[in-house]
């Protein structure tokens, strides 16, 4: 049966809606649409003739229409008018016409509400409040929203007017929301701008802040008073009945014992009317003067002076603390406390003594901190350090030597050559260097305050031949599975090439082999016994080469599992027994001999001559290697049988 | 009575440039979608462009994409399609046509006006 479907059903305003026709008839010739629920020429929108897919517009076309070849409409820009039922007239070629009808109804796109109010300012628990959704519209419904959460269920709350006023009786500080209205027909919802419910409260009774109620003579009382309340309340102070000011803090300097007393806050809300005080008492104590610190010996001198920091000043009966670098003492038998606290002395002071320092005089309140103290510890110079670490420099580059040595006072420099004096600077710097230049460079670090001088000594070889490299270690005996080895090849060159062999081929890749340092370093991470190689080091540069002398590795492993020879297990009585023990090992190992669990020799090899039947039973050797500090074990049984008793048995040696 | 007449066609060369009317009349073109389709001996029918007044938007095929501008003049009531660049391939009968502002369905009952691209 032909029939038509709106999609949609519901149309907005300015939107488009598809009259779908379905299970139109085969063979047609044409087909026509007509608003309304019956064919009427009058009415006609449009038709549509197969044969030529020619559409014709008819008298109640709008332009707005367009007809599908499958005989469906779609109707463009909907208006109101256009709300009400369609009919289809189908012509089939037999000229046998069907009809069928459809229909949709059309909504306005709804306006965005607002919501008005009877009473913009409601006292707590006093009035009512009535919200109105605003514009009144046709067949909308009109929903709520308070804090974008629907209505909460309360006997407080009260919908009328077909939803579109809700009143708020007997209003509470906690209606104070953001209040909403929402708009809805078939094809539109809207909400408003959220209006926020203003309620006036209050005072509460005020709370007065901090809570402290002692304080020091010599401080600053500074108390402040809130009181929940909408509008903001009025603050007064009054300090034993008498007034003193219209703040909401209260601020006195340098109080002393006659500031004790009686506090008290009122708040007042001009709007509500209503007034509240809440009552605090003070009590103010007199108080020792702040302390400070005293030093017997303000420049100290590392690992040679002691100093003693005193607390001042000196009052009977009052508890000492001390705190370094903000924390407590630590427990150090450097440091020693004198039997009232108030002195504290650092025994041969270090440079990481240098603090801050506090002392502290106890009080019935609280604890009063002196001003932090640094001492001054002059210490050093430590061995300076002279950059960069090259040794070896080719003609015709700049030298140029820093030098550093840790120091307080900052350390002053001398630079010597071959034992003479070149100046006193912190750098050296010798531009454009020959053969000339090689020779032993001493940096000296002095300190002035202390008296004291450290120098290094660097031999600088200025060279276009490389010298013969040579391999320095981190381990000369590392242990199996457990240690790493870093090889370095000397000396540091500038602008060199360095190389590695091992067994005299390069170095295979493996990760447990690493270069670094500009391949400088070569790094074995746990090393095995098959590590103990010869590595040679190779240094090369635009001019020349040159390679090492190998260094061998000597891995120290094992033992492994040790082996007892011969196999034989069975002998006849009367052979002699010859048990020989052998453990891989690096060092060789200390062998040791039990027999049925008894102690027997320290020897690899164990000889019992003309066993007999007592010689049964299991024979232990043990292995210990003292330098990779490891041992093992292994058991063996042995049987001895009467003479001829088992033929085919091991004569024995 | 509702009808739309197109004129303007004519014979241009190619890389030349044509302006199409369509005077409509029995309704407003400012309430509903107009645009154009062209028919080719042997090609399928296309609409080139359209132009919804009451939503201000165009459509372009992608075959006229930058060459081919199309506008309304609501108070004479008329439509416009001014061709640019114009190519041998751009040669139909254009037909001023009412459109979907969203799907591809259109109406037209026009005689049309004929476009020929030729050097």
């Known amino acids: 049966k032909l029939t038509i479907e709106s999609t949609p059903f519901n149309v907005a305003e300015g939107k488009e809606v598809l009259l779908l026709v379905h299970n139109l008839p085969q063979h047609l010739f044409g087909y026509s649409w007509y608003k309304g629920e019956r064919v009427d020429g009058n009415r006609q929108i449009i038709g549509y003739v197969i044969g030529t897919q020619q559409a014709t517009p008819g008298p109640a076309y709008s332009g707005r229409e367009i007809i599908y070849p499958n005989a469906s409409l779609l109707i463009q820009n909907i208006i109101q008018n256009d709300t009400g039922f369609y009919t289809l007239h189908v012509i089939k070629s037999d000229l046998v016409n069907e009809e069928a009808t459809g229909q949709f109804r059309v909504y306005p796109e709804l306006p965005k509400p607002s919501i008005s109010s009877n009473n913009s300012k409601p006292v707590e628990d006093k009035d009512a409040v009535a919200f109105t959704c605003e514009p009144e519209t046709q067949d909308a419904t009109y929903l709520w929203w308070v804090n974008n959460q629907s209505l909460p269920v309360s006997p407080r709350l009260q919908l009328s007017n077909g939803n579109r006023t809700l009143t708020l009786f007997n209003v509470t500080r906690n209606d104070t929301a953001s209040y909403k209205c929402e708009t809805q027909n078939p094809v539109s919802a809207r909400r408003s701008d959220s209006v926020i419910l203003n309620v006036l409260y209050g005072p509460d009774a005020p709370t007065i802040s901090p809570l402290n109620t002692s304080y020091r003579s010599g401080e600053n009382l500074n108390l402040s008073c809130h009181a929940a309340s909408n509008p903001p309340a009025q603050y007064s102070w009054f300090v034993n009945g008498t007034f003193q000011q219209s703040t909401q803090e209260l601020f006195i300097p340098n109080i002393t014992v006659n500031n004790s007393g009686s506090y008290t806050c009122q708040a007042h809300n001009s709007d509500t009317g209503l007034n509240r005080t809440t009552v605090t008492t003070i009590t103010v104590y007199a108080e020792p003067p702040k302390p400070f610190i005293t030093s017997n010996n303000s420049n100290p001198v590392e690992d040679e002076d002691a100093v003693a920091l005193t607390c001042e000043p000196e009052i009977q009966n009052t508890t000492y603390l001390w705190w370094v670098n903000n924390q407590s003492l630590p427990v150090s038998p450097r440091l020693q406390l004198s039997n009232d606290n108030r002195t504290l002395t650092l025994l041969s002071v270090t440079r990481n003594d240098v603090g801050p320092y506090e002392c502290g005089i106890q009080n019935e309140l609280s604890v009063d901190h002196s001003d932090p103290v640094i001492l001054n510890v002059l210490y050093g110079p430590d061995d300076p350090t002279i950059s960069p670490s090259y040794t070896y420099y080719r003609p015709g580059v700049n030298l140029s030597l820093s030098c550093h040595a840790a120091s307080n006072p900052p350390a002053q420099y001398s630079w010597l050559i071959d034992g003479n004096i070149q100046q006193h600077t912190q750098e050296l710097f010798i531009s454009n260097i020959t053969e000339k230049n090689s020779g032993l460079y001493t940096c000296q670090a002095n300190n002035s305050a202390s008296g004291h001088s450290r120098t290094t000594v660097k031999t600088i070889t200025v060279s276009a031949e490389l010298p013969k490299p040579s391999i320095s270690s981190n381990n000369s005996k590392p242990v199996e599975d457990k240690d790493a080895v870093a090889f370095t090849c000397e000396p540091e060159a500038q602008n060199t090439t360095y190389l590695w062999w091992v067994n005299g081929q390069s170095l295979p890749v493996s990760p447990r082999l690493q270069l670094s340092n500009g391949n400088r370093t070569l790094t074995l991470f746990n090393v095995t016994r098959n590590d103990a190689r010869a590595y040679v080091c190779g240094i090369q540069n635009s001019v020349s080469a040159n390679r090492s002398d190998p260094v061998t590795l000597d891995v120290l492993y094992g033992p492994d599992t040790p082996i007892i020879s011969p196999p034989d297990s069975s002998y006849l009585s009367g052979a002699n027994l010859n048990l020989s023990c052998h453990s891989a090992s690096n060092p060789s190992p200390q062998y040791s001999w039990r027999i049925n669990g008894i102690p027997q020799q320290h020897t690899q090899v164990l000889f019992i001559a003309k066993i007999t039947p007592n010689n049964n039973g299991t024979y232990a050797c043990f292995v210990s290697n003292l330098a990779t500090g490891r041992n093992n074990s292994i058991v063996k049984s042995i049987t001895v049988s009467a003479s001829g008793t088992s033929p085919g048995l091991s004569a024995g040696a | 009575e509702v009808q739309l007449v197109e004129s303007g066609g004519g014979l241009v060369q190619p890389g030349g440039s044509l302006r199409l009317s369509c005077a409509a009349s029995?309704?407003?073109?400012?309430?509903?979608?107009i645009g154009w389709v062209r028919r080719a001996p042997g090609k399928e029918e296309e609409l080139v462009a359209g132009?919804?007044?009451?939503?201000?938007?165009?459509r372009y095929a992608d075959s006229v994409k930058g060459r081919f501008t199309i506008s309304a003049d609501t108070s004479k009531n008329t439509a416009y399609l001014q061709m640019n660049s114009l190519r041998a391939e751009d040669t139909a009968v254009y037909y001023c046509?009412?459109?979907?502002?969203?799907?591809?369905?259109?109406?037209?009952w026009g005689q049309g006006t004929t476009v020929t691209v030729s050097s």
């Open positions: 046509a009412i459109v979907s502002q969203s799907r591809s369905v259109y109406n037209y």
């Open positions: 029995g309704f407003n073109i400012k309430d509903t979608c």
């Open positions: 132009i919804c007044e009451y939503t201000g938007s165009t």
